[in-house]
Interface confidence: low
């Protein structure tokens, strides 16, 4: 058993048929000593007397508010959570695996620039009695320290017979240096809670490796004179790293036809500027990545043709 | 060329020899994302790779102040990883295969790092730890750990040649 | 060769003040961040607080915040904490060092400085 805050407590136990579980004791958080009772959540019935009361925990009825009383009053409260493992592996039953990039990602990451700033989300069934608290260092054997906000619902999706709720927290590193190669990855760890179920979660990376920009801006078409072709050009994400001589990005640039069959055009250019040929019912979109390091492709930036 | 006493490096060389690096590191070892190789005990193997770290001036207000702290911290990595490339780790079976980026990513880092520092001069280079893995399936390992980990430093080193390319060249 | 000396360290009432300072040399102190850690009597050693390469911005933890500031002189490679209304649990030997990503994953610490608060 373990604090996870104060008056909440999390039993770890093995979950399998007719397991022993864990025996528990605990104290009422008062000088009082005699005539003292202990209830749990909404029941009357009393489980025990006196300043202390041992119980064995082994299933969900087990776990939930302990309250000891004494004459009517209120004397103070432990939560009791469970945190299960299932043949030597602790359960994910909260959030949902999002199998991208591979399977068991539970945690996704993206990072705009390189200032120390990044969001991660999740998703899960889960509508009701849910809560998550989200704990970040960079390196864990001598943490430095990244401060997260509170994890907000920000999207609610149907898929199905079910809707799927997703979660985010964004994070910042206390002390971020843009230029540095890591050496030290970031960690996440996201503390979920469903009604009396206990379950962690952990995501380790690099900066580098979670970098995504945003799509870059004011994408404009300038028809060359006689000719099919257009100059298209384009400006630097405004959330990305500056200096750009020093933080470049890499663009891609392609000319697709309405019909998603057809032949895709693709340029490649370190410019904020090149010259392809505009066919009709056309879209021209461009992308961007970092120009030193293959971290992911931003969204597409498009424009008609016409 | 950044030679000890402080002179300017040939930024421009320097920057287009860095990207072609990057080019290379990222042929060799594509796999971004889909082999988490941290989580194969990295401890003992990335410890000693020389980092470039805050603190050794590769930002742009440090390559502005004075660009020597970052060249010589960068010149101590492509020896270092020069080395490792040149290394039984990536001479050892099992073989690369001929036309495998390695052999040509092994010259461009000889030749950036001769760029940074001509004949004669020396800075002092960071010891290559002795990493001699027994089996192939190791070595396989600690090459793919390399190439993440000289992805990270040559893109760094991209970033300062470029800037200083573009906002340094007398 | 990278060094961190701390100083200005002693005994001081409940409710005193005291300035530490850390010098550096052997790296470009100018761009890097630094911190204050402590480390109390039997405990691990813990962030106090951290100023970025320009001293504009600066991050302290709850436990100090309001009583402890932190400031740097880059043309003097010192970076200062200066500590108010000391509590006795502020007892701990104060060390600096940069917050970033250390020096490798084997970080270098200076010898530290014992400040010591009690009546």
């Known amino acids: 058993i373990w604090e996870l805050k104060k008056d909440v407590y999390v039993v770890e136990l093995d979950w399998y048929p007719d397991a022993p579980g864990e025996m528990v004791v605990l104290t009422c958080d008062t000088p009082e000593e005699d005539g003292i009772t202990w209830t749990l959540d909404q029941s009357s019935e009393v489980l025990g007397s006196g300043k202390t009361l041992t119980i064995q925990v082994k299933e969900f009825g087990d776990a939930g508010q302990y309250t000891c009383h004494k004459g009517g009053e209120v004397l103070s409260h432990s939560l009791l959570l469970l945190h299960k493992k299932e043949d030597g592996i602790w359960s994910t039953d909260i959030l949902k695996d999002q199998k991208e990039p591979k399977n068991k990602t539970f945690l996704r990451c993206e990072a705009k620039n390189y200032s120390g700033r990044f969001t991660c989300w999740w998703l899960t069934t889960i509508s009701t009695d849910l809560t998550f608290s989200v704990k970040s260092s960079r390196g864990s054997s001598d943490p430095q320290g990244v401060t997260c906000g509170a994890a907000t619902l920000s999207a609610e999706r149907v898929r199905g017979d079910n809707k799927e709720y997703e979660y985010s927290v964004e994070c910042q590193e206390d002390s971020a240096c843009p230029a540095a190669e890591e050496s030290l990855p970031i960690e996440v760890m996201v503390d979920a809670v469903h009604k009396l179920k206990y379950e962690n979660y952990t995501s380790s990376f690099f900066i580098r490796d979670i970098i995504k920009p945003d799509p870059p801006k004011n994408l404009q078409l300038k028809p060359l004179k006689n000719s099919r072709q257009v100059e298209v050009s384009w400006e630097y994400p405004d959330t990305w790293s500056t200096p750009h001589s020093y933080f470049s990005l890499t663009f891609c640039v392609q000319v697709q036809g309405k019909s998603k069959r057809e032949k895709k055009d693709r340029v490649f250019t370190d410019k904020t500027s090149a010259t392809v040929i505009c066919r009709k019912n056309a879209s021209i979109s461009v992308r961007a990545q970092d120009r030193y390091y293959s971290s992911s492709w931003s969204e597409w930036a498009s424009v008609p043709c016409s | 060329r950044a030679v000890p006493g402080g002179s300017s490096p040939a930024w421009t060389q320097c920057q287009q020899l860095s990207q072609k690096l990057c080019t290379l590191a990222w042929s060799a070892h594509p796999l971004v994302g889909h082999m988490d190789l941290r989580e194969e005990g990295d401890e003992e193997t990335t410890n000693d790779v020389p980092h470039i770290q805050c603190g050794d001036g590769c930002d742009p207000q440090g390559l502005r102040d004075n660009s020597q702290f970052c060249l010589q911290r960068i010149h101590q990595g492509l020896i270092f990883y020069e080395k490792l490339l040149g290394s039984d780790i990536f001479t050892g079976e099992p073989s690369l295969l001929p036309d495998s980026p390695v052999g040509q990513l092994h010259a461009s880092l000889l030749g950036l790092s001769q760029l940074l520092q001509p004949e004669g001069h020396h800075w002092e280079t960071q010891q290559i730890p002795s990493l001699s893995p027994s089996q192939p399936w190791q070595r396989l390992l600690l090459r793919f750990k390399i190439l993440r980990s000289l992805q990270a430093f040559v893109a760094v080193a991209a970033r300062v040649f470029a800037h200083g390319a573009a906002t340094l060249s007398p | 060769q990278l060094q961190l000396v701390e100083s200005g360290g002693g005994l001081v009432q409940p409710g005193g003040s005291l300035r530490l300072s850390c010098v550096a040399s052997?790296?470009?102190?100018?761009?890097?961040?630094m911190a204050w850690y402590r480390q109390r009597p039997g405990k691990e050693r813990e962030l106090v607080g951290s100023?970025?390469?320009?001293?504009?911005?600066?991050h302290y933890v709850d436990a100090v915040k309001g009583r402890f500031t932190i400031s740097r002189d880059n043309a003097k490679n010192t970076v200062y904490l200066q500590m108010n209304v000391l509590k006795p649990e502020d007892t701990a030997v104060y060390y600096c060092n940069s917050p970033n990503t250390g020096w490798g994953t084997r970080r270098y610490w200076g010898q530290g400085t014992q400040v010591t608060v009690s009546s």
């Open positions: 052997g790296f470009a102190f100018s761009t890097y961040a």
């Open positions: 100023i970025d390469s320009s001293g504009d911005n600066t």
